[in-house]
Each structure stands twice: as C-alpha cells, then as structure tokens.
C-alpha cells in the first residue's frame, strides 16, 4: 500500500538568466528511493538520478543542470522557454512510483521572486 505523499515547491518564478532549485520531498513512508526522474513539460527527461549509477543528464541540459540540494536539482541559465511544468518521479521500494508537479515561470522582470514554499499538489 502506498502511504507516502510528495510535497513540491509548487508554483515558482525566477529571473531569466538566473537559476532555480526544483525540489520534491517524499514523506510519510519508509520506502527506499531507488531512482528519481526529472521531466519537463513536454515529458522529455532532464535528468535521472539512480542510487547506484548516479546522475544521467540528458544532452540538451548537460551544461545547465546541477545536482541537488538533496534529491532536487538546480536548473541554471534560465530562458523563457524553460517556463512550464516539471515533474519529479520517485521510484521506491516497495511502494512503487510517486509523482510531483512544479510549475516554473521564467520572468524577464528584474523583480522576479523565487518562492520555494513546499506544498502538496
């Protein structure tokens, strides 16, 4: 039975050219995380993080993705095209798969605020 819940940073905004931390947090379960997948709005993979194999960064993001903190990732050198939905998928044993959603808005404005308050989708 899947008892856990995924919290995410929810809706966040960041400045063009800046960076943003995408974080999900799995709680209320003793299940062991074996892999975390990060996908973009069109369901293309940004990165896969496997317990044994480490990180696999997809070519389009190879110079822009920094690991962490924790199980999150940092997306650097933001462009307007980065605006959209991001999904974290936690593969766990024995629970199975948990999925969280983050919406990132990249702003031209110099007053963009990076909010990172966790919420349950």
């Amino acid at each position: 039975m899947m008892t856990g819940t995924i919290e995410t940073t929810g809706n966040i905004s960041a400045k063009k050219g800046g960076s943003v931390i995408l974080q999900c947090h799995l709680s209320s379960t003793m299940a062991q995380v074996t892999q975390v997948n990060w996908e973009q709005h069109d369901h293309s993979l940004l990165a896969i993080r496997n317990a044994e194999l480490g990180w696999h960064i997809y070519p389009a993001f190879k110079d822009r993705v920094a690991p962490g903190p924790g199980l999150g990732l940092t997306l650097q050198s933001l462009t307007m095209n980065d605006t959209g939905e991001y999904f974290c998928t936690y593969h766990t044993y024995p629970d199975g798969t948990y999925r969280g959603r983050i919406f990132l808005e990249v702003l031209e404005s110099s007053v963009a605020e990076h909010s990172a308050r966790f919420q349950i989708p």
């Epitope: 696999h56 960064i57 924790g70």
Partner: antibody, heavy 117, light 107 residues
Amino acid sequence: QVQLQQSGPELVKPGSSVKMSCKASGFPFANHVMHWVKQQPGQGLEWIGCIFPFNEITNYNEKFKVKATLTSDKSSSTAYMELSSLASEDSAVYYCAREQLGSFAYWGQGTLVTVSA
Amino acid sequence: DIVLTQSPATLSVTPGDSVSLSCRASQNIRSNLHWYQQKSHESPRLLIKYASQSISGIPSRFSGSGSGTDFTLSINSVETEDFGMYFCQHINNWPFTFGSGTKLEIK
C-alpha cells in the same frame, strides 16, 4: 567495490597553497557528486562544497568560497581540492565523500593538512 | 544557514544500555537528515538516512525517528564497538551543515 583514496599528509607554511586529491574507483565517477568536508582536531564536521564531474559544476559553502577550489579530472577519476592562503585555522583533516541519493555513503580516509612555520 | 543542535554533548553509558541522541534543526527540514558515526582516527560512516531509513550493513540496533525540527537516533542495547562520536547532517538546502556531535563514552 567503491573506494576513495586520498593523497597523503601535507605540512605547509602559512600563506602557501596545497592541492589534495581523491581518487575514485568502483563506480562511474563522472555521474556522482563528490563532496569535501573539513574536520579540525577534536572538532565537528564542516561541509566545504561539492563538484559534479560530469559538467564540472560546483557548489560552495559561502564560508569556503575564497579558501577552496574544487576541480575534477574524469579521465583519471580524481577529484581535487586546492586550499589557498593557508593559516593555522586551516590545519585539519579533509575528507572527500561520494553522495548517493543525498547521503554521504562513501568516505575517503582523509588528508591531514598541518599549517606551521 | 540551518543550525543543527545535538544533545547531550557527551553521553556516558554502560554496554547493554539503550540510549537516545537528539538533533534539533533551527528550521523545518522535513526528513532531510542523516546520522553518521565516527570512531577515533576513522572516517565518518553513514548510519541512518532520511531520518529513519536503515542502511545496509548497519546493525539493526540503530534506528532513527523524527521529522521537521526534532530528530532522534536510538541505539538499542549499546555494544562496546558503538562508542565514539555521532553527527547529524541536513541536506535540505545549501549549505549542508552538521551538528556539533554527541560523544558516546563508556561509563
């Protein structure tokens, strides 16, 4: 099996620099985040920073941003840390550690740095 | 930066006793906390990850609990090999920080 072999002890003069190494084996080095941790004699642990060898992206503890420079060489599976402008408070054991899904699952044996005139 | 406060600083126990070590975070870190053991002249060793998850090869007498700001490492029936330093560490955000440690010593 995973191994992190650190370079030997260093006795250095105040004001000089030192570069230590952490040679990794038993895992795909480029795909794992490597961290560095400081421990002064009889004291606790301080996180210095980390490097992702795949793209050389680093993240530093603000406290060590001027003091430490992290680099890596994928061809030799080795992480490096250079410490500059050494002073007595830099005398410590420095550990490298490999991250595994957010925890420091594997540690090197440590490199002792002694700063003395 | 998040401050991790460990208590007590020193714990004197007799082998066979059961003990609890505390780690308190200055802000909510959810379960993003790990515990490490360090024996004299050795490197730290991961004991518990994400507050309560066990580590392969670590004896089952070690267990962790807590979430948010208050965390506990429990050792059920301490053995002589357990004496040493214990550190908590958060990975909630940059920079990662460690607690100042609890020394577990023989009474």
